[in-house]
Interface confidence: low
Amino acid sequence: RAPRCRELPAQKWWHTGALYRIGDLQAFQGHGAGNLAAPISGLKGRLDYLSSLKVKGLVLGPIHKNQKDDVAQTDLLQIDPNFGSKEDFDSLLQSAKKKSIRVILDLTPNYRGENSWFSTQVDTVATKVKDALEFWLQAGVDGFQVRDIENLKDASSFLAEWQNITKGFSEDRLLIAGTNSSDLQQILSLLESNKDLLLTSSYLSDSGSTGEHTKSLVTQYLNATGNRWCSWSLSQARLLTSFLPAQLLRLYQLMLFTLPGTPVFSYGDEIGLDAAALPGQPMEAPVMLWDESSFPDIPGAVSANMTVKGQSEDPGSLLSLFRRLSDQRSKERSLLHGDFHAFSAGPGLFSYIRHWDQNERFLVVLNFGDVGLSAGLQASDLPASASLPAKADLLLSTQPGREEGSPLELERLKLEPHEGLLLRFPYAA
């Protein structure tokens, strides 16, 4: 008799794929000729692109009125006219819904100012946030984000209260909190009193780009948070290129998409957008490179392989890799909600298995180092339910040159510098 199938866990929409942050709508829209529409309307025109990325939610803004450091001139219920109107926003919500893309609104109050939370007027601000949650929930948003919560006094209790409002409206609504902290204890104390909170932090940004260190960070985090759902990113707002050299971008994409939890990216992460390439552009919000005309001030500064258009036409590009990983992440049960087991594969490497019941299983092997390495996969580290076969099929490599679909002998696995492999193998009873 076949073994009984394991009961599927209840999955919310944010469990099913990546979130995509658009912190600066004007930068996302691009400054190229013809971009005269209000940025919110411009974003509506980019929903097909976002659908092609298979992202499940957009984290938008902040877009509310905020006069720098002036609490009286900060209105969380009003959209800053620089971004568009309430009508533009309603229209965006409707269009996004039709494409099954959820919209999360960032309500970080003083986003233009020194202290995001007007430290001296916390109670006034907290009341404004409460009112805004109710207002925007009624308007149809799917969730909220608040950032820099390390600057919010009594953050845990405020977050619990805001979580109650959000979940009270519907269990299908999400609250994301962001912190600049990379300290595990601080992160755990924020999570302690907020069971369903999704927290983005700088925890992984300190990975030191070595396989062992990254493995230890990930496993420590998962052990400490138990079986609660988590998110994976390198920071609460910034681009991957702020933290990573170009040669590690593919590796991190593969890792973020295959760890157990919700991957969270910033606009431009899918193409390796880097502010350093665009003189005069702010590090935290460089212009999105849709094509070579997106940065018109400097003829020749932007080459095709830096843009969405150029990378869309190249099956070996970072964007193509992002799309493939996002697709796998959103449809494979083992990646959607499978168990996770990290195991030893040798110095410099980080490897783990994702598996769910009798579904196809996935093996991830990541080489963070600058030298090629042979993987010594230590299957003895794994529980019986997650044993390794002798061979696994190559689903994809972050480096060109390997034949996809070909079976690889796991005992003889060699990885190029900065190479990540995603391998698949069937369940064996």
Partner: antibody, heavy 125, light 108 residues
Framework: QVQLVQSGAEVKKPGASVKVSCKAS????????MHWLRQAPGQGLEWMGW????????NYIQKFQGRVTMTRDTSISTAYMELSRLRSDDTAVFYC??????????????????WGQGTLVTVSS | EIVLTQSPGTLSLSPGERATLSCRAS???????LAWYQQKPGQAPRLLIY???SRATGIPDRFSGSGSGTDFTLTISRLEPEDFAVYYC?????????FGQGTKVEIK
Amino acid sequence: QVQLVQSGAEVKKPGASVKVSCKASGYTFTGYYMHWLRQAPGQGLEWMGWINPNTGDTNYIQKFQGRVTMTRDTSISTAYMELSRLRSDDTAVFYCARIRVYYESGIYNYPLHHWGQGTLVTVSS
Amino acid sequence: EIVLTQSPGTLSLSPGERATLSCRASQSVSSSYLAWYQQKPGQAPRLLIYGASSRATGIPDRFSGSGSGTDFTLTISRLEPEDFAVYYCQQYGSSPWTFGQGTKVEIK
């Protein structure tokens, strides 16, 4: 091709001001920061700061704060650097310079690639 | 600010010889943001190397750069007559951008 052409040599008395110009051609002037540097006779190079010709935003190093003013006139693609309250130790060649974006193997870089020919400012009583 | 110290101050060599110039930083510099410039009397500096080891457009391959962290080197494999000049290293990874005091390569 990119060219930065600076104004001619100047002789100034201590306490006076000098304004050096840098006319850009061969690229969109508003697209790149303009950097200013100086070099005293027989000495090394010293970076003074930059102006963003697009917005007029400036960034000066501490040493020159209060004495230097960088401006631009986008209609004639020209940047200016004015140094006031001149002293004899301000005698130097002043350069304007512009970065170039290099992109290869997925890595970006932006060193100072294009330089003006330099303007000698002599401060002497 | 990051202080860059170049050594030696002067290097006396003959054409055809190999020149090795050193640049040491007071704190770690991202190797992506270290450049070398050549300057001849009465001329503006000319970019030779950026990103510690990449040659700028039009620079002959006898010039090469290496190093990371706090120690960087410019090597001229075989000195040509036109290579006798002053060489500066510069970091542009953190503000303020700073230069070394220069190394003069003179004919022996």
